[in-house]
């Protein structure tokens, strides 16, 4: 043999109750003592420093903390130092060290030394990983040590999660034993934070302990909080908000069209969207994923707004007898009312609608002019005026006539036409034909499709000519021999030529 | 030199008490143990045990447990030895003996008494 | 304990001469850990205190003559005095000190 010691390392003990630190030690053979003594020390190995002596076989002297509490098991004639420490309190917590002593010079302290911890709670040993929907395993460990006070074990807050199945007195690695207990169960997510506790009770004694660990169950996301379909008001502020419950926390992501507008690891995300433009409305997606899965939820925005400014497509300028199609457009949120008006009529409307088709069929000089294309909803009306031309041959109107006052006669030539006639004068008693661009004798007033053109003739009162006024567009040519009106027409009447 | 200078001779009634000294010059108090050997009158020599010197931890031969203690006052590096109730059979010379000590780490090896004192006779009769 | 027995108790030998003390222990004091024999001698002469002569079973103490000789392992050693002198007179005692610490009976060397 040799010097040494075999004892754990480290034992444990519940507070009030007693440990066996069970310990055997060799020597050289040679040594032959005739009797074996041994000195148990705590917490420092060295005489010199005068540690406590927690048992001495030559001598009944230990120090008052182990005072009618420590004795020794083993026979140390047989190398064995098993030790029994009674009533243990969180003093005696520390390291034991044994010494041999086998006379003569030969006292020897070993290295190896046991270091006893006195616990007041049961070990409760939870997985690192506990995921919802798995299968776990949680145990109750309890140190099993005291040989005159034997633990049993019971569990608390268990309900609903299984039975438990008891293993047992098991012999751990350096020889010290722990009572089990088995706890087998499939967590829910709402087994998270629940308290599970362990108690360890001593029969025949108040002795009691409990001791209690909270499940993390890791579970994946599930969005719990979202806004339902939001409507805004074009420049108001939206916020729009996930939360998500899961373990551990999400990464929170709001997107819209795959384009991420805000992410944080978070329990909620709000999206704040300052003075809303048209241009957001549309489905957002909060996206909460962790370790353990994911999920997602939509949830879209209507941002309301006044019709923009109308938009007029379609044939402005038309031939009398053509059919005249025009579009109107315009975007808004809700759609709105459009109406088409023509001087203050209303052509044609539409409910709740982007666009509107006005159709003219076989258009006719009053269908020339200004149109107006309005569109209406609750948050504000836009118009958008337009114009269309009918284009038609001249006609003379009847107002068209010749006067005679003094020396002078005057001929009027009103002629609707568009576009825009030539107007000429014709004198055939005198083989003179007068164009409007003869400023001197003719002036011409337009007013809209009308043109008037007046001609003036001076010295010819006593004989008014006969006066023929031709109006010319692309369209055709219109002559009208002009009337005359007044005294002289009478005079002429009656006279005669 | 070495040298274990003990006090000197004792008489004393049985049931009294002796103190023995044995004071060491010339060498390190604490470098070597102080042994105590028992010489009855015409009789061989009985060893009782021995002190560290440097733990001051004494140790006892299985013979003389009980009325027997060593103890030191490193100080003046004097080992003692004190017998209580003495008897008649406890009449003796007694000897103080060092021994060198090799220490390493929390534990030493002891080694042959090398230097002994001139003894000192305890005479118990009543 | 280790008990050691010497032989013979008393011994007589002309000076000049070689004197031989044999010591038996009970048990083996050689040591595994360093293979040294635990045993010493020692002379002792009357009103004095024990002398050390040979420790590890062979080896002499300083300042002793060399006439003293050690030898033996395990069980049996011998304590050899050569050329006796007049002031060799005395009793020998052999001594163990592997495990509790014993003599031996003692030897009384005497002039033939």
């Known amino acids: 043999g040799h010097w040494g010691a075999w004892m754990p390392s480290s034992i444990s003990a519940f507070e009030g109750t007693c440990v066996s630190i069970p310990c055997r030690f060799d020597f050289p053979d040679e040594l032959r003592p005739a009797v074996v003594h041994g000195v148990w020390y705590f917490n420092s190995p060295y005489p010199k420093n005068y540690p406590p002596v927690v048992f001495k076989s030559r001598t009944q002297v230990v120090h008052e903390s182990f005072q009618g509490r420590s004795r020794l098991l083993g026979d140390l004639g047989l190398r064995n130092c098993t030790l029994l420490l009674s009533n243990v309190s969180p003093e005696l917590g520390g390291k034991y060290y044994f010494r041999g002593d086998l006379g003569g010079y030969n006292q020897y302290t070993f290295s190896e030394h046991s270091v006893l911890d006195i616990v007041n709670t049961p070990n409760i040993v939870v997985p690192p990983e506990v995921v919802a929907g798995t299968e776990v395993e949680v145990s109750c460990m309890v140190p099993d040590n005291c040989p005159e006070l034997r633990p049993e074990l019971s569990w608390l807050g268990h309900e609903g999660l299984g039975e438990p199945a008891v293993l047992g007195r098991l012999r751990e690695d350096e020889g010290t034993w722990v009572q089990v207990s088995l706890l087998h169960f499939v967590p829910t997510r709402e087994a998270n934070g629940h308290r599970l506790g362990c108690q360890a009770s001593f029969p025949n004694t108040t002795l009691q302990f409990e001791g209690y660990a909270s499940m993390d169950v890791k579970y994946p996301p599930v969005i719990v909080e979202m806004n339902s379909s939001v409507e805004a008001i074009e420049g108001s502020h939206v916020s729009l908000l996930c939360g998500a419950d899961s373990n551990p926390p999400p990464l929170l992501t709001w997107m819209r069209d795959g384009t991420v507008l805000r992410e944080a690891v978070a329990e909620s995300l709000l999206l704040e969207l300052e003075e809303v433009t048209p241009a957001e409305d549309g489905v957002y997606a909060c996206l909460a994923e962790n370790a353990y899965g994911q999920d997602n939820r939509t949830v879209g925005l209507s941002v309301m707004y006044a019709p923009w400014k109308p938009t007029v497509n379609g044939t402005m300028v038309a031939v009398e007898g053509e059919t005249v199609s025009i579009l109107c457009s315009t975007q808004s949120n809700p759609d709105p009312i459009l109406t088409i008006f023509k001087e203050k009529q209303i052509l044609s409307t539409v409910i709740y609608e982007s666009e509107l088709q006005l159709e003219l069929p076989a258009v006719s000089p009053e269908d020339d002019g200004e149109y107006w294309c309005v569109a209406e909803n609750q948050y504000g009306q836009r118009a958008t005026a337009f114009n269309l031309s009918v284009e038609f041959a001249p006609v003379l109107l009847l107002e068209s006539h010749c006067a005679a006052a003094r020396d002078t006669v005057q001929c009027l030539c009103v002629v609707k036409s568009n576009p825009e006639p030539s107007v000429a004068f014709e004198l055939p008693s005198r083989n003179v034909t007068v164009n409007e661009s003869e400023r001197e004798f003719v002036y011409s007033e337009r007013s809209g499709l009308v043109l008037t053109s007046i001609l003036t003739l001076r010295g010819q009162a006593q004989a008014p000519p006969r006066v023929i006024c031709t109006a010319r567009n692309l369209y055709g040519a219109k002559s009208l021999e002009l009337p005359f009106q007044g005294a002289h027409r009478l005079m002429w009447a009656k006279i005669g030529p | 030199q070495v040298q274990l200078v003990q006090s000197g001779s004792e008489l004393k009634k049985p049931g009294a008490s002796v103190k023995v000294s044995c004071k060491a010059s010339?060498?390190?108090?604490?470098?070597?143990?102080m042994n105590w050997v028992r010489q009855a009158p015409g009789q061989g020599l009985e060893w009782m045990g021995w002190i560290n010197t440097y733990t001051g931890e004494p140790t006892y031969a299985d013979d003389f447990t009980g009325r027997f203690v060593f103890s030191l006052d490193t100080s003046v590096s004097t080992a003692y030895l004190q017998i209580s109730s003495l008897k008649a059979e406890d009449t003796a010379v007694y000897y103080c003996?060092?021994?060198?000590?090799?220490?390493?780490?929390?534990?030493?090896?002891?080694?042959?008494?090398?230097?002994w004192g001139q003894g000192t006779l305890v005479t118990v009769s009543s | 304990d280790i008990v050691m027995t010497q032989s013979p108790d008393s011994l007589a030998v002309s000076l000049g001469e070689r004197a031989t003390i044999n010591c038996k222990s009970s048990?083996?004091?050689?040591?595994?850990?360093?293979?040294?024999?635990?045993l010493a001698w020692y002379q002792q002469k009357p009103g004095q205190p024990p002398k050390l002569l040979i420790y590890?079973?062979?080896t002499r103490e300083s300042g002793v003559p060399d006439r003293f000789s050690g030898s033996g392992s395990g069980t049996d050693f011998t304590l050899t005095i050569i050329n006796l002198q007049a002031e060799d007179v005395a009793v020998y005692y052999c001594?163990?000190?592997?495990?509790?610490?014993?003599f031996g009976q003692g030897t009384k060397l005497e002039i033939k």
């Open positions: 048990h083996s004091v050689l040591y595994s850990s360093n293979q040294k024999n635990y």
């Open positions: 590890w079973a062979s």
């Open positions: 001594h163990q000190y592997l495990s509790s610490l014993t």
């Open positions: 003996a060092r021994n060198p000590i090799n220490y390493y780490g929390i534990n030493y090896e002891g080694y042959v008494m090398d230097y």
């Open positions: 010339g060498y390190t108090f604490t470098n070597y143990g």
